[in-house]
């Protein structure tokens, strides 16, 4: 014999306390499948999360963090603080990277610097607390008679298209 | 929009059965329950039964037992009450509802008169 | 079968008053899942009958915010803050979580 449940769609659920009727699911409330027995209880995006998607009768709400905080876990189920470029969050809060690290992001931690001499390359631009090291050419590659070196291109400025 | 719209006034003799049709639209029929509800005049609403979404499965009042049918056609998204053996008490005028809500009627057809005269 | 009993049968209120109609049911109308199984209908003069209020307080769409739905258990009240002329008609209470479902027997409002 059929489960009488199993006709029930997504938005419903078999309500045994009325003689199995798919009843709609009450507010607040979803079911992502059907022949659901109950309807799952929506997300609710408080605090520091807000709504990305609301909830519907077939699916969840959806979060993500207000400005200044960045979503952590799957579906977003922390919120951690922002810290600025060239800082990491600690449980102090955030603090600056120590000297010979560096974080480009306003999340994450603090990374050392590129080591450009374990590659046999020299520093071409120094570290700094928000960008790593740049490494250049070896120095064996500079030096005379060597193929000479393609300086970079220089660097268009933003909104303009190459001619 | 979503809207019930159902079959025009019917004139039985008692002894006979009167079948009422109630066209969904706006909205998919085998998702949301239909029931039937009554008005006698001059009498509270009288709920009959309902049909189930997707399964067509019913559920009938105590009151009508063995003289209501519920039906429906699903590619018509069309919902049916047929009464049997039809008596003056039975006088009325008949609604469609759609559970739109949990455990609420939110959309309701325009209503059937039947008149039961010999 | 659970009984629907309505007070006041008639309820006759001034434009811009508040009114308040009572349905009392004889067994509680809890369901499991927390909410009350109770529907406030509006039926005006010549039309079919119209959603107001349904899990007790949850105002339907399109509803003017002057209805509202408050009560728990057995014991449910319908309020209007500010009856408009709009409003007239039969006022139902119905129980949709036991079959037989069930209707008060009505509350007529009118205007003074």
């Known amino acids: 014999l059929q489960d009488p449940c199993s006709n029930c769609p997504a938005g419903t659920f078999c309500d045994n306390n009325r003689n199995q009727i798919c009843s709609p699911c009450p507010p607040n409330s979803f079911s992502s499948a059907g022949g659901q027995r109950t309807c799952d209880i929506c997300r609710q995006c408080k605090g520091v999360f807000r709504t990305r998607k609301e909830c519907s009768s077939t699916s969840n709400a959806e979060c993500d963090c207000t400005p200044g905080f960045h979503c952590l876990g799957a579906g977003c189920s922390m919120c951690e603080q922002d810290c600025k470029q060239g800082q990491e969050l600690t449980k102090k809060g955030c603090k600056d990277c120590c000297f010979g690290t560096f974080n480009d992001q306003k999340r994450g931690i603090c990374r050392p610097w590129t080591n450009c001499s374990l590659d046999g390359k020299s520093v071409l631009v120094n570290g700094t607390k928000e960008r790593d090291v740049v490494c250049g050419p070896s120095p064996a590659d500079l030096s005379p008679g060597a193929s000479s070196v393609t300086p970079p291109a220089p660097a268009r400025e933003p909104g303009h298209s190459p001619q | 929009q979503v809207q019930l719209v159902q079959s025009g006034a019917e004139v039985k003799k008692p002894g006979a059965s009167v079948k009422v049709s109630c066209k969904a639209s706006g909205y998919t029929f085998t998702n949301y329950p239909m029931h039937w509800v009554r008005q006698a005049p001059g009498q509270r609403l009288e709920w009959m039964g309902w049909?189930?979404?997707?399964?067509?499965?019913?559920k009938y009042s105590q009151d009508f037992q063995g003289r209501v049918s519920i039906t429906r056609d699903t590619s018509a998204s069309t919902a049916y009450m047929e009464l049997s053996s039809l008596k003056s008490e039975d006088m009325a005028i008949y609604y469609c509802?759609?559970?739109?809500?949990?455990?609420?009627?939110?959309?309701w057809g325009q209503g059937t008169v039947v008149t039961v005269s010999s | 079968d659970i009984v629907m009993t309505q007070s006041p049968l008639s309820l006759p209120v001034t434009p811009g008053e508040p009114a308040s109609i009572s349905c009392r049911s004889s067994?509680?109308?809890?369901?499991?899942?927390?909410?009350?199984?109770l529907g406030w209908y509006l039926q005006k003069p010549g039309q079919s009958p119209q959603l107001l209020i349904y899990l007790g307080s949850h105002r339907a769409s399109g509803v003017p915010d002057r209805f509202s739905g408050s009560g728990s258990g057995t014991d449910f009240t319908l309020k209007i803050s500010r009856v408009e002329a709009e409003d007239v008609g039969v006022y139902y209470c119905?129980?949709?979580?036991?079959?037989?479902?069930?209707f008060g027997q009505g509350t007529k409002l009118e205007i003074k």
């Open positions: 067994q509680r109308l809890l369901h499991s899942n927390g909410f009350n199984y």
């Open positions: 119905m129980q949709p979580l036991q079959i037989p479902y069930t």
């Open positions: 509802a759609r559970e739109g809500v949990a455990g609420a009627f939110d959309i």
């Open positions: 049909s189930n979404a997707g399964s067509g499965n019913t």
